[in-house]
Interface confidence: medium
């Protein structure tokens, strides 16, 4: 069955429509298109001869029509007067004619919309904002987009006025957008330019960086303060409660132990009128803020039980540190056979017993830092009966 299909069925004025043909017979001599629901020579648009690949315009041809070898008809720059029925007549190679009729509708194209707002500089958690999509037109669907995505389900988002108005209740800093509205009719869709919100917020609780607490005498102390805020926050520094300066960064060269104390960053947003502070403790000390990883060594790692002794040594280049020992996650010494010497640097086990087999490690620490060695495994063997000549039986 020969059929035609309009692509699209609903056409925007000024655009084009393709009258597609389905189930076109294989053996054809040619075809003709007519305006209307029947074949009428006075309303012929175009004829096409397959053999000559030649299109011949008819009385109803407007110059906007193109016929293709597959019998499809393209009409460009359509007007509302083009709305209606179109009939295709096919001349088959058995000289029997076949006809099919289709139709399409032409609608005016929609303009590009725009967004109006009742407040483009709202305050976070305080203000509401209403967006309205312009213009208001009949038979039009209004859609909204936030960050190029359709509206999420949220109690803070309300649509009204036939979806033409979008209201944001109690805006947050994440509501900056961009916002776009789209208008649609059966044939066209048009999206507005994006609109963004300048949401005023903050300051949040400031963060002082770097996070270091311990400094050596003679070092430079450089602290930076940041608090999320719109507009950007104004900063000031206090040391031990005494105002120092109104900058985002604080720099003190060649510090001494006297520079130890509490450092306060104060952030202020002049628009919201809000203030936030953060206090950081700085300690200036000779002690190493980072203790290096110690090395552990054993006089031997495989010993004979009830006979041998073993010495484990914990080595470090750091000064002013203490050492402690661990065996199977227990602190040592745990028996009278274990002795610590040379400022806990050496752990001696004498004699070694079966229960001493396992993993040992040491830890070095000072008041502000610690570090532990890699573990070392101690193996404890018990001899069987001695073999003559030390040879295994053969």
């Amino acid at each position: 069955q020969l059929t035609t299909e309009s692509m699209p069925f609903n056409v925007a004025e000024g655009k084009e429509v393709l009258l597609l043909v389905h189930n076109l017979p294989q053996q054809l001599f040619g075809y003709s298109w007519y305006k209307g629901e029947r074949v009428d020579g006075n309303r012929q648009i175009v004829g096409y001869a397959i053999g000559t690949q030649q299109a011949t315009p008819g009385p109803a041809n407007s110059g906007r029509e193109t016929i293709y070898p597959n019998a499809s008809l393209l009409i460009q720059n359509v007007t509302q007067n083009d709305t209606g029925f179109y009939t295709l007549q096919v001349i088959k190679s058995d000289l029997v004619n076949e006809e099919a009729t289709g139709q399409f509708h032409v609608y005016p194209e929609l303009p590009k919309p725009s967004i109006s707002s009742n407040n483009s500089n709202p305050v976070e958690d305080k203000d509401a904002v209403a967006f309205t999509c312009e213009p208001e037109t009949q038979d039009t669907t209004y859609l909204w987009w936030i960050n190029n995505q359709s509206l999420p389900v949220s109690p803070r988002l309300q649509l009204s006025n036939g979806n033409r108005t979008l209201t944001l209740l109690s805006v947050t800093r994440n509501d900056t957008g961009p916002y776009e509205c789209e208008i649609q009719n059966p044939v066209s869709a048009n999206r507005s330019d994006p609109v963004t919100l300048n949401v005023t917020y903050g300051p949040d609780t400031p963060t002082i960086s770097p996070s270091d607490t311990y400094y050596r005498p003679g070092a430079n102390l450089s602290l930076s303060c940041y608090a999320a805020s719109n507009p950007p926050a104004q900063y000031s520094w206090l040391i031990n409660g005494t105002f120092q300066q109104s900058t985002q960064e604080l720099f003190i060269p060649n510090i001494t132990v006297n520079n130890s104390g509490s450092y306060t960053c104060h952030a202020n947003n002049s628009v919201t009128g809000c203030n936030r502070t953060t206090v950081k403790t700085i300690i200036v000390t000779e002690l190493s803020p980072v203790v290096a990883k110690p090395q552990i060594k054993a006089s031997k790692t495989t010993v004979t039980g009830d006979k041998d002794s073993v010495n484990l040594t914990c080595s470090t280049n750091d000064t002013g540190i203490s050492i402690r020992w661990f065996f199977k996650n227990q602190s040592l010494p745990s028996s009278e056979r274990m002795k610590l010497s040379q400022g806990n640097t050496t752990l001696s086990i004498n004699p070694v017993k079966r229960e001493d087999a396992g993993t040992y490690w040491c830890e070095v620490f000072n008041p502000i830092s610690k570090n532990q060695s890699d573990p070392i495994m101690l193996n404890v063997n018990y001899n069987a009966l001695p073999q003559e000549n030390g040879l295994s039986p053969g």
């Epitope: 053996q27 001599f29 040619g30 397959i50 053999g51 000559t52 030649q54 011949t56 001349i91 000289l95």
Partner: antibody
């Protein structure tokens, strides 16, 4: 019964003119494309020209372009071939033939009996 | 020289099957329908096959046409003495915007 009857052939000198006619009967002449086909003595068929059913589309063989003119009068059910600047190589039997495809894919289902044109001095 | 190429002659005995070939190009046979015509001595041509393989009413089914690519063939089975005639293939040529014929094949029925 479909009938095509050619007339107007004869002897003509080189450079001369002749007008052939083909009277059609037994079918709706205005619904069919029509062609002229010629055959030189002892030679094969050579297509000359075609005219669409309404007369809006016309094609010629390269060998006759500018010298031969096809036309039709649907009210008289008659096809014509005006022959000018005739040459010796135009000597042939001229057949009119009906195209049942309305010119969409020319094929010739009915032929006249032919009329002989001789171009000689 | 004809645009479509046919063998100048062919022959066969009564009852035999004979095939006549017709070779062209993409602008004619390759993309357009082929017709075959029979011309008995001293008469006007008669349409045997149109649209590559279709027979007009009144043409015996001993006559069949086929096409592959840029070549076409006319087959006559059960050959009869009255089939002795000239046979022409024809097709529209899209490049030259004109109808072209083969040079014709003279079929002789022997015996």
């Amino acid at each position: 019964e479909v009938q095509l009857l050619e007339s107007g052939g004869g002897l003509v000198q080189p450079g001369g003119s002749l007008r052939l006619s083909c009277a059609a009967s037994g079918f709706t002449f205005s619904n069919y494309a029509m062609s002229w086909v010629r055959q030189a003595p002892g030679k094969g068929l050579e297509w000359v020209s075609v005219i669409s059913h309404g007369g809006g589309s016309i094609y010629y063989a390269d060998s006759v372009k500018g010298r031969l003119t096809i036309s039709r009068d649907n009210s008289k059910n008659t096809l014509y071939l005006q022959m000018n600047s005739l040459r010796a190589e135009d000597t042939a039997v001229y057949y009119c033939a009906r195209d049942p495809t309305k010119g969409y894919a020319p094929t010739f289902d009915y032929w006249g009996q032919g009329t002989l044109v001789t171009v000689s001095s | 020289q004809s645009v479509l190429t046919q063998p100048p002659s062919a022959s066969g005995t009564p009852g035999q099957r004979v095939t006549i070939s017709c070779s062209g190009s993409s602008s004619n046979i390759g993309n357009n329908y082929v017709s075959w015509y029979q011309q008995l001595p001293g008469t006007a041509p008669k349409l045997l096959i149109y649209a590559d393989s279709k027979r007009p009413s009144g043409v015996p089914d001993r006559f069949s046409g086929s096409k592959s690519g840029t070549s076409a063939s006319l087959a006559i089975s059960g050959l009869r003495s009255e089939d002795e005639a000239d046979y022409y293939c024809g097709a529209w040529d899209s490049m030259g915007n004109g109808y072209v014929f083969g040079g014709g094949t003279k079929l002789t029925v022997l015996g």
